[in-house]
């Protein structure tokens, strides 16, 4: 759910990590209605998701730590 | 009703590893992250680590990556933690704990009843 | 040494209002809901408040929480001899140390 690169929803599905090459977060204060994480998966799709959920912390942290260990 | 029903008491000694199990019962596993927590006594809550069993991948805290491994058998719906190289201040309650993984509250809403880990030569 | 900070102890007599304090940083508390656990001893951890302020069903009203930048607090009002008891808050953290964290406790005595 997304317009002019900004989301305007979030996703209802968990997202499985291993489907995801990495994110982009959205900042209500710059420009966009809502805070989100933006997921960008092999499919070369975004799927917008709740930054607040556990599954989408969770999956950020895995995210973060991979690139930290690079 | 989700309950979570732990493995018993252990005593080990210094420099090795126990294992303890956490089943559960009552509900399906695919939306729930389960975390171990343990207390020392005397000591506060500290988070070990976490698994989301549906990703199949697990997440330590710092002061036990290297020497924890938490696993998931979905088909029995039981979580595992091994902790290797045991220390004396590894005595400890170890608690595992459910959280509903497509909320945003991050709370640990069911526990199990604890398991005991003695170090002790 | 807990990443979140609360006081060791806190005591009132039946009836009264007890308040603990739970402080953080703007990685746990201040972008994430923090949550309160009772501790009996011998027994599990009960989650008491989630979401900052929200109680699950079989959680009197007497506990109440609140949040306000990078600081917590949970309230007892109506204090009485079975909230004798230790009480932990909680929160995720963004910083990649480990991301739950544990306040160290504060033992809650009814006098």
């Known amino acids: 759910a997304s317009n002019f690169d900004c989301c305007l929803g979030y996703t209802d599905r968990i997202l499985h990590p291993k489907f995801i090459v990495g994110f982009t977060r959205q900042l209500a204060n710059e420009g966009c209605d809502i805070n989100a994480i933006i997921f960008h998966t092999k499919k070369k799709l975004s799927v917008c998701a709740n930054p607040k959920q556990t599954w989408v912390k969770y999956i950020v942290r895995l995210l973060s730590k991979k690139v930290k260990n690079m | 009703q989700v309950q979570l029903v732990q493995s018993g008491a252990e005593v080990r000694k210094p420099g090795s590893s126990v294992k303890v199990s956490c089943k559960a019962s009552g509900d399906t596993f695919n939306n729930f992250a389960i975390s171990w927590v343990r207390q020392a006594p005397g000591h506060g809550l500290e988070w070990v680590g976490g698994i989301i069993p549906v990703f199949n991948t697990a997440d330590y805290a710092q002061n036990f990556t290297g020497r924890v491994t938490i696993s998931a058998d979905k088909a029995t719906k039981t979580v595992y933690m091994e902790l290797r190289s045991l220390r004396y201040d590894d005595t400890a309650v170890y608690f595992c704990?459910?959280?509903?993984?497509?909320?945003?509250?991050?709370?640990?809403?069911?526990w199990g009843q604890g398991t005991m880990v003695t170090v002790s030569s | 040494q807990s990443v979140l900070t609360q006081p060791p102890s806190a005591s009132g007599t039946p009836g009264q209002r007890v308040t603990i304090s739970c402080s953080g940083t703007?990685?746990?508390?201040?972008?994430?809901?923090v949550s309160w656990y009772q501790k009996l001893p011998g027994t599990a951890p009960k989650l008491l408040i989630h979401?900052?302020?929200l109680r699950p069903s079989g959680v009197p009203d007497r506990f109440s929480g609140s949040k306000s930048g990078t600081s917590a607090s949970l309230a007892i009002s109506g204090l009485r001899s079975e909230d004798e008891a230790d009480y932990y808050c909680?929160?995720?953290?963004?910083?990649?140390?480990?991301?739950?964290?544990f306040g160290g406790g504060t033992k809650v005595t009814v006098l």
């Open positions: 979401s900052n302020n």
């Open positions: 909680a929160a995720w953290d963004d910083s990649l140390s480990g991301p739950v964290v």
């Open positions: 704990a459910r959280t509903k993984i497509e909320l945003d509250n991050d709370a640990f809403d069911i």
């Open positions: 703007t990685s746990n508390i201040g972008s994430n809901s």
